[in-house]
Interface confidence: low
């Protein structure tokens, strides 16, 4: 057993039907010595008495917000969360596991540019009873500051008959140094719990390999005399890293006709314009990605040929 | 060249050939499947390479200041990576094949360090780790970290020569 | 997300029967799971678990008769032996009894008769 | 094996009205108890876990208590559609037991 925070506790079950369970001493916390009882969560039966209670937690219905009373007057809480533990793996009952890059991915990361600031989101399909809290930083033996805000839901969606929340948690690294190669990956913990049950998730990264630059702005055709050929330009996104000059990006144009059968004509350049040829109906796209790190490319922005 | 006395290398033919290293880098270890490496406990592999840092003066405004800093660490890095893909890491078991772009890599290597540092001078250099893998598979890991970290320092030192090429080229 | 039961039919006294229960939409990994029955007109009789780790526990009028057991892991077995016509009776699986969001199967039949 | 004794068997109550429903466990079963709803044809649903925590979707007119080895289900302003059987089940975590059923009829 073990302090989530203040007055709440978990407690570490392997959750199999005849467990023995884990014995666990609740003591009131008050400098009364007798008279005291224990109720557990909104139940009028008393469960003990005495200053401390000893509790075998075996199941859900062990845990709970124990709560010792003297003469009708509450003196203290105890909430107790369980952690349970399936076939020595930890339970991941609370997130949707999202496959994305790979199964068992609970949480993922995204960063707009190298200045530390990165954005984690994680899907659940339940809608209450649901705290989280992060924390995050910079390697884990001597970890280096890492400040995240509330999560928050972010998104809710409809997937078949269940309803689907997104949360998300943006999180700003307190010494960025966005030049630097990076040797120790950044560490995201989650706690999660839902009514009773408490669980964790983790992920480990380095922002280089989380970037995923905005889409290019002010992106224009300019059709060229006497051609079918436009010339396409654009600019970086305003939120990428800046001076451009070190912070370089790459780009990909794409014609793409209105049919998406139709055959897409690409062309990749280290420039912020290029010379396309532009079919009637068609649109041309462009995506940026780091020059010289291929972690992921933008979503497209586009424009109509016409 | 980036001589030790303080001069200034050929900015834009460091940039053209450590943007091709990046393209080597990544051609030679695309990312499978985002295969997360770190995951296989690399303490005693890849902790010894040498990372830029961000006291090395690699930050635009350090090479501003002095770009000599910074261009020992990358050659320092440079020469490490070089000695490495030469090692039996990846002339060992299992053989690579015949047009991997390994080869290439390790000569782009030795060119950008030969561009940085000519005959005759010398920067201190890193010693390489004793790194000898007994086992085939082990040394398959070992080759995909060794270049998933080639991978990020390349992609500093392009940035470095893509931003003296633009900034600090006479 | 569904239990279906399987494999209830008429049987002649003595004879033995394996029913199934399969699961569909869900996971079976992270629960007990508990057979159940229920004569004609009757209450309802617990009869055994299969735990998480595969422990299995009976009541004590079916040890000896009746085995669990878990052929995969979206599949619960009930074996039957030397039945009597005490034994007709609907069988239900159930997924954690003792949770909130226990499932239940909707039974199967079974007849003992000559 | 934990003897779960059951009562009363039947009872009626009219729409509006409470109905008590009392199961006894021949020894301590901590939380390990669940109240269980049947209506003919269907598999059982289950109303209430862990001695009093309502399952989602059951309406607030469900309660349940213990006191000891003793819980109680309790209706109060009964429905037409609470017409059912209801059975207390528990046990020790290892073997479990139903009580007797109480099959209510709304008046």
């Known amino acids: 057993i073990w302090e989530l925070k203040k007055d709440v506790y978990v407690v570490e079950l392997d959750w199999y039907p005849d467990a023995p369970g884990e014995m666990v001493v609740l003591t009131c916390d008050t400098p009364e010595e007798d008279g005291i009882t224990w109720t557990l969560d909104q139940s009028s039966e008393v469960l003990g008495s005495g200053k401390t209670l000893t509790i075998q937690v075996k199941e859900f219905g062990d845990a709970g917000q124990y709560t010792c009373h003297k003469g009708g007057e509450v003196l203290s809480h105890s909430l107790l969360l369980l952690h349970k533990k399936e076939d020595g793996i930890w339970s991941t009952d609370i997130l949707k596991d999202q496959k994305e890059p790979k199964n068992k991915t609970f949480l993922r990361c995204e960063a707009k540019n190298y200045s530390g600031r990165f954005t984690c989101w994680w899907l659940t399909t339940i809608s209450t009873d649901l705290t989280f809290s992060v924390k995050s930083s910079r390697g884990s033996s001597d970890p280096q500051g890492v400040t995240c805000g509330a999560a928050t839901l972010s998104a809710e969606r409809v997937r078949g008959d269940n309803k689907e929340y997104e949360y998300s948690v943006e999180c700003q690294e307190d010494s960025a140094c966005p030049a630097a190669e990076e040797s120790l990956p950044i560490e995201v913990m989650v706690d999660a719990v839902h009514k009773l049950k408490y669980e964790n998730y983790t992920s480990s990264f380095f922002i280089r390999d989380i970037i995923k630059p905005d889409p290019p702005k002010n992106l224009q055709l300019k059709p060229l005399k006497n051609s079918r050929q436009v010339e396409v330009s654009w600019e970086y996104p305003d939120t990428w890293s800046t001076p451009h000059s070190y912070f370089s990006l790459t780009f990909c144009v794409q014609v793409q006709g209105k049919s998406k059968r139709e055959k897409k004509d690409r062309v990749f350049t280290d420039k912020t314009s290029a010379t396309v040829i532009c079919r009637k109906n068609a649109s041309i796209s462009v995506r940026a990605q780091d020059r010289y790190y291929s972690s992921s490319w933008s979503e497209w922005a586009s424009v109509p040929c016409s | 060249r980036a001589v030790p006395g303080g001069s200034s290398p050929a900015w834009t033919q460091c940039q053209q050939l450590s943007q091709k290293l990046c393209t080597l880098a990544w051609s030679a270890h695309p990312l499978v499947g985002h295969m997360d490496l770190r995951e296989e406990g690399d303490e005693e592999t890849t902790n010894d390479v040498p990372h830029i840092q961000c006291g090395d003066g690699c930050d635009p405004q350090g090479l501003r200041d002095n770009s000599q800093f910074c261009l020992q660490r990358i050659h320092q890095g440079l020469i490490f990576y070089e000695k490495l893909l030469g090692s039996d890491i990846f002339t060992g078991e299992p053989s690579l094949l015949p047009d991997s772009p390994v080869g290439q890599l390790h000569a782009s290597l030795l060119g950008l360090s030969q561009l940085l540092q000519p005959e005759g001078h010398h920067w201190e250099t890193q010693q390489i780790p004793s790194l000898s893998p007994s086992q085939p598979w082990q040394r398959l890991l070992l080759r995909f970290k060794i270049l998933r970290s080639l991978q990020a320092f390349v992609a500093v030192a392009a940035r470095v020569f893509a931003h003296g090429a633009a900034t600090l080229s006479p | 997300q569904e239990l279906k039961e399987s494999g209830g039919r008429l049987v002649t006294p003595g004879g033995s029967l394996t029913l199934s229960c399969t699961a569909s939409?869900?996971?079976?990994?992270?629960?007990?799971m508990t057979w159940v029955r229920q004569a004609p007109g009757k209450g309802l009789e617990w009869m055994g678990v299969?735990?998480?780790?595969?422990?299995l526990n009976y009541a004590s009028w079916a040890q000896g008769r009746f085995t669990i057991s878990k052929p995969s892991s979206t599949t619960v077995d009930l074996k039957m032996t030397s039945l009597t016509t005490e034994d007709t009776a609907t069988y239900f699986c159930a997924r954690g009894t003792y949770s909130g969001d226990s499932i239940w199967g909707p039974g199967t039949l079974v007849t003992v008769s000559s | 094996d934990v003897v779960m004794t059951q009562t009363p068997s039947s009872t009626s109550a009219a729409v509006g009205g409470t109905v008590t429903i009392k199961c006894q466990a021949s020894q301590s079963i901590s939380s390990w108890l669940a109240w269980y709803q049947q209506k003919p044809g269907q598999p059982p649903k289950p109303l209430i876990v862990r001695a009093s925590i309502l399952t989602s979707g059951v309406p607030s007119r469900f309660k349940g208590s213990r006191s000891g080895t003793e819980y109680t289900l309790t209706i109060s302003g009964v429905q037409r559609e609470d017409a059912a059987t209801y059975y207390c089940?528990?046990?020790?975590?290892?073997?479990?037991?139903f009580g007797g059923g109480t099959e209510l009829e709304i008046l």
């Open positions: 939409g869900l996971t079976l990994g992270s629960y007990s």
């Open positions: 299969i735990g998480v780790g595969g422990t």
């Open positions: 089940l528990g046990g020790d975590g290892h073997v479990s037991n």
